[in-house]
Interface confidence: medium
């Protein structure tokens, strides 16, 4: 009799789609790295399913993920960061599906923060600045940022600007006068590391002055 009988019908389980995706975050907590995986099908019954990573690890051959509701998560210093790791979905000792992944190619940076916009009356422009924790990191230092802004009334008309620095100048004449704007920023690795866009920073809202109206710092 199958050793997995108490875990439900394994034959039925093998018919399910166990496709999953993962992202890594390097030095997300001091020198600790994290790896987060989740099933692509939100309806997968995750009872008794475990994730395991093997290979390209320091001091150990394999590590098991912790389960946090519907995501699976590891926080560790033990990622070698060279070579591919084998990430498997398991029931007991049986692997249902595996992927070979280089953790340096699935990096998701932390979201930028401290986004602000200052209006310079004399220059007739807006200086956008933000911060990123990656400036202090050893590994994922070089990022491409995506600044997106829109007039608040234009639901889906976002204008995007890509930049590698954390400062951007928007010309007043390119914006509508006396309008409320929403702006936000996200980041993606842009050098040795590859991966995904970070979450968006919290939005910042600012109002453009009316024409010929002198104004200082934006709200």
């Amino acid at each position: 009799e199958s050793g997995y009988a108490q875990n439900g019908d394994l034959e039925d389980a093998e018919l399910d789609d166990y496709s999953f995706s993962c992202y890594s975050q390097l030095e997300v907590n001091g020198s600790q790295h994290s790896l987060t995986c989740a099933f692509e099908d939100p309806d997968v019954n995750t009872t008794n399913l475990e994730f395991e990573i093997c290979g390209a690890l320091v001091e150990v051959k394999c590590l098991n993920f912790r389960k946090l509701q519907e995501i699976y998560f590891i926080e560790t210093k033990k990622f070698l960061l060279i070579g591919k790791s084998n990430i498997c979905v398991k029931v007991g000792e049986k692997s249902l599906t595996c992927k070979k992944i280089d953790l340096t190619t699935i990096v998701k940076p932390e979201a930028p923060f401290d986004l602000s916009v200052i209006y310079r009356e004399g220059a007739n422009d807006f200086v956008v600045t933000f911060n990123t924790s990656h400036l202090q990191k050893k590994y994922v230092k070089v990022l491409m940022h995506d600044v997106a802004y829109r007039q608040e009334k234009d639901e889906n008309k976002w204008t995007h600007v890509n930049l590698s620095s954390t400062k951007l100048t928007l010309l007043q004449r390119k914006l509508q006068p006396a309008a409320m704007y929403e702006i936000k920023v996200r980041s993606i690795p842009d050098h040795y590391f590859k991966g995904f866009w970070s979450e968006w920073s919290p939005s910042y809202y600012f109002r453009t002055p009316e024409i010929n109206n002198s104004s200082g710092e934006m709200d």
């Epitope: 093997c54 390209a56 001091e59 060279i82 070579g83 280089d102 340096t104 040795y192 590859k194």
Partner: antibody, heavy 121, light 109 residues
Amino acid sequence: EVQLVESGGGLVQPGRSLRLSCAASGFTFDDHAMHWVRQAPGKGLEWVSGISWNSRGIGYADSVKGRFTIFRDNAKNSLYLQMNSLRAEDTALYYCAKDEYSRGYYVLDVWGQGTTVTVSS
Amino acid sequence: AIQLTQSPSSLSASVGDRVTITCRASQAISSALAWYQQKPGKAPKLLIYDASSLESGVPSRFSGSGSGTDFTLTISSLQPEDFATYYCQQFNSYPLWITFGQGTRLEIK
């Protein structure tokens, strides 16, 4: 059978160039980082250069930096070392080696038999 | 870069002897160390990885120990085929970098 076969060595004058090749077989080449290690006559092992599976991670020993270039062609299961501005001190037996990071640490578990480079006028 | 210093540089021993070779790192490397054996005219052969894990097919008379900066390779009972040169090796993953010790030549007394 896992195998690495180096070629391209020979006698070359100082300042000239040479390209070494390493043909890999018996394993999934594009899953593994690869290295060049050399050994001068009667001397110890010296790591020369390494390249990650996808060519994005590359390293060189200080003694060859700026003169040697490592590259790979995963479609051809081949590793290369382009050696420019050769010096007498580059004379050595050059080994191609495969990493096996699944061991937990970065170790070289398969080595070729080497190809000899002699730099002399 | 981290330096690895092996000692002794050479030693003479007899069949059946217990032999210890040490490798000292210039800074702590956890257990990121491997040992290789090289016989004249041959390519190096992996013996030990993770400081103490025995490579498949390597006789159990070989063992490794240590962590941090001090590591040892021990051959519990020397066999005639063990006379060779032994190297320790360390790696750094970012940037990619490998360092070898200068080698220890083990000769028949």
